[in-house]
């Protein structure tokens, strides 16, 4: 079982390989000096049907380096960064993992592209392994909370309350969604 030639890359090169390309072979992409690699640099020859070989993912791309590019902090609810730190410049990558009791959908790594957006795929999502969810928390008078969405919230996530200026927060500032589908505390109040 073998793979066909790896997908070509513009303004870059592919590591050495011999043919036929056996299943298990890794080829690596790199970019010329003034270009930045966007996407996974390694492709693996795999087989899904034990008959034909195929590459396990699309080839990355080489973008002309944009020194002015800068990407915003990427947020994955239920997840956290295991690699990457601000500032995020063109070609920088961030890798995510999911918190306990969350499973990942999508690709764990994204790259800062020349257009100031993360890619080449969308940010991953971390999905609760528990079917239970906590009901949406109410807004409070003279205050706000971080979760502006009206939908329910997965266990492991939290909501942070704050008060408008001149008001004092009474109660818990941070309320966690428990695996039972219940909130860890009642919403606080904002008092003068």
């Amino acid at each position: 079982i073998s793979c066909g030639s790896p997908p070509p890359i513009l303004n870059g090169r592919i590591s050495y390989y011999s043919t036929p390309i056996a299943v298990g072979t890794v080829i690596r992409y790199s970019c010329s000096g003034t270009f930045r690699l966007i996407g996974e640099k390694s492709l693996l020859c795999i087989t899904k049907d034990k008959v034909d070989g195929t590459w396990d993912k699309p080839a990355p791309k080489c973008e002309y380096f944009n020194k002015y590019s800068s990407c915003p902090e990427p947020i994955v609810p239920g997840g956290y960064k295991i690699r990457g730190s601000t500032p995020y410049r063109h070609g920088d990558s961030v890798t995510f993992a999911c918190k306990t009791n969350f499973s990942m959908n999508g690709n764990k790594s994204v790259w800062c592209q020349a257009n100031n957006m993360w890619g080449p795929t969308r940010l991953p999502t971390c999905v609760s392994v528990f079917p239970l969810e906590c009901p949406a928390l109410p807004m409070i008078h003279n205050g706000h909370h971080t979760s502006e969405n009206v939908g329910s919230i997965a266990p492991g996530l939290s909501v942070t309350y704050s008060c408008e200026s001149g008001y004092l927060l009474v109660g818990e500032k941070i309320i966690n969604c428990l695996s039972s589908g219940k909130w860890s505390a009642v919403p606080p109040t904002c008092e003068e």
Epitope: Y16, Y17, E40, S42
Partner: antibody
Framework: QVQLVQSGAEVKKPGSSVKVSCKAS????????ISWVRQAPGQGLEWMGR????????NYAQKFQGRVTITADKSTSTAYMELSSLRSEDTAVYYC????????????WGQGTLVTVSS | EIVMTQSPATLSVSPGERATLSCRAG??????LAWYQQKPGQAPRLLIY???TRATGIPARFSGSGSGTEFTLTISSLQSEDFAVYYC????????FGQGTKLEIK
């Protein structure tokens, strides 16, 4: 960090076979690659082959082709290396090593297993 | 097979001084090179990957450079714990190691 724990030292006769195990804990065993690297006494490191458990297919260095078999048991997160037709030159410490995401370099190593081939 | 050649075989340096180890590839390997440190009776430890990126927890005194066929590992100010054997490894095409450089106290 992933921990790799190897089986104990072995003494073997020429012409026989040896099977060394490498149990992984931490991380997702099936998605990373396990290589076997050996080191003869006072010598350098020599790559023998590797397996990606999720694929179940192993690749071998030409020198060891036909004499080494690398397998993996996903249910126990254990990789195995079997070397047959042993000769005195196979006396070495055998290491298992882990590479993540087909990175090509080894972040984690087992403690090593000394295999002595002697009549 | 891509042949990796390290030099010198043995390097004698005093603590606090700078050590420079070389590794040459038989053909271009881009930046697909790693450096490892090995102490007697221990498994190798990853120091540098992609020719110049320090692995997690590796002190800043270790640095790697080079691309193509010529690579260098530099230890800026040698500590007593740095005296060991150092190996380079290519991963451009499968995997091969250099024969090692023994770094000893002068």
């Amino acid at each position: 960090q992933v921990q790799l724990v190897q089986s104990g030292a072995e003494v073997k006769k020429p012409g026989s076979s040896v099977k060394v195990s490498c149990k992984a804990s931490g991380g997702t065993f099936s998605t990373y690659a396990i290589s076997w690297v050996r080191q003869a006494p006072g010598q350098g490191l020599e790559w023998m082959g590797r397996i990606i458990p999720i694929l179940g297919i192993a690749n071998y260095a030409q020198k060891f082709q036909g004499r080494v078999t690398i397998t993996a048991d996903k249910s126990t997160s254990t990789a195995y290396m079997e070397l047959s037709s042993l000769r005195s030159e196979d006396t070495a410490v055998y290491y298992c090593a882990r590479e993540d995401d087909s990175s090509g370099y080894y972040q984690d190593w087992g403690q090593g297993t000394l295999v002595t081939v002697s009549s | 097979e891509i042949v990796m050649t390290q030099s010198p075989a043995t390097l004698s340096v005093s603590p606090g001084e700078r050590a420079t180890l070389s590794c040459r590839a038989g053909q271009s390997i881009n930046s697909y090179l790693a450096w490892y440190q090995q102490k007697p009776g221990q498994a190798p430890r990853l120091l540098i990957y992609d020719a110049s990126t320090r692995a997690t927890g590796i002190p800043a005194r270790f640095s790697g450079s080079g691309s193509g066929t010529e690579f260098t590992l530099t230890i800026s100010s040698l500590q007593s714990e740095d005296f060991a054997v150092y190996y380079c490894q290519q991963y451009e095409y499968w995997y091969t190691f250099g024969q090692g450089t023994k770094l000893e106290i002068k």
